[in-house]
């Protein structure tokens, strides 16, 4: 199966751990470190706030 884009951290995201549990076998996600799925979501939300996508806000 193809890897979902939000399953893998991007280098520029900083404190990030992969959403895919196979990529994070130790389960080290903490309050300070967001999963890649959440960061992908939040980055999209921020882009929309800046008017890149649907421009609501």
């Amino acid at each position: 199966l193809p890897t979902l884009p939000w399953s893998v951290c991007q280098e520029e995201w900083g404190d990030c751990l992969p959403s895919d549990p196979d990529l994070d076998p130790v389960g080290t996600i903490t309050n300070e470190t967001k999963s890649s799925a959440e960061l992908y979501f939040l980055k999209t939300v921020l882009q929309q706030k800046d008017g890149i996508e649907d421009g609501l806000g």
């Epitope: 939300v45 929309q48 800046d50 996508e53 609501l56 806000g57």
Partner: nanobody
Framework: QVQLQESGGGLVQAGGSLTLSCAFS????????MAWFRQAPGKERKFVAG????????YYDDSVQGRFTISRDNAKNTVYLHMNSLKPEDTAVYYC????????????WGQGTQVTVSS
């Protein structure tokens, strides 16, 4: 002041389904992206799913991908989490959260609703 009120939790057998609702009030719903989180006993709160402001884009944690569906009804100011093929490890308190476009966190949180999946 924004208020988020979750409902729909309960006890369900493994393999069953539940739909959680989160009613939003106090401000303009479409100004906020919405997300569901869960916190299992003794564990940290974890992102489950998110939906963007207008609703077409959805994001899921790998642990629920293909089993859970997040949706929103902007006419009813409500976000939903449809949960299918539930597993005992889905047992947790489920929270909804509203985000106005801040990567570092969420503007508002609900009080949570308990979901218990028995084997």
């Amino acid at each position: 002041q924004v208020q988020l009120q979750e409902s729909g939790g309960g006890l369900v057998q493994a393999g069953g389904s539940l739909t959680l609702s989160c009613a939003f009030s106090g401000r303009t719903f479409t100004h906020y992206a919405m997300a569901w989180f869960r916190q299992a006993p003794g564990k940290e709160r974890k992102f489950v799913a998110g939906v963007t402001r207008s609703g077409p884009n959805t994001y899921y944690d790998d642990s629920v991908q293909g089993r859970f569906t997040i949706s929103r009804d902007n006419a009813k100011n409500t976000v939903y989490l449809h949960m299918n093929s539930l597993k005992p490890e889905d047992t947790a308190v489920y929270y909804c959260a509203a985000n106005s476009g801040v990567v570092s966190g969420y503007d508002y949180w609900g009080q949570g609703t308990q979901v218990t999946v028995s084997s």
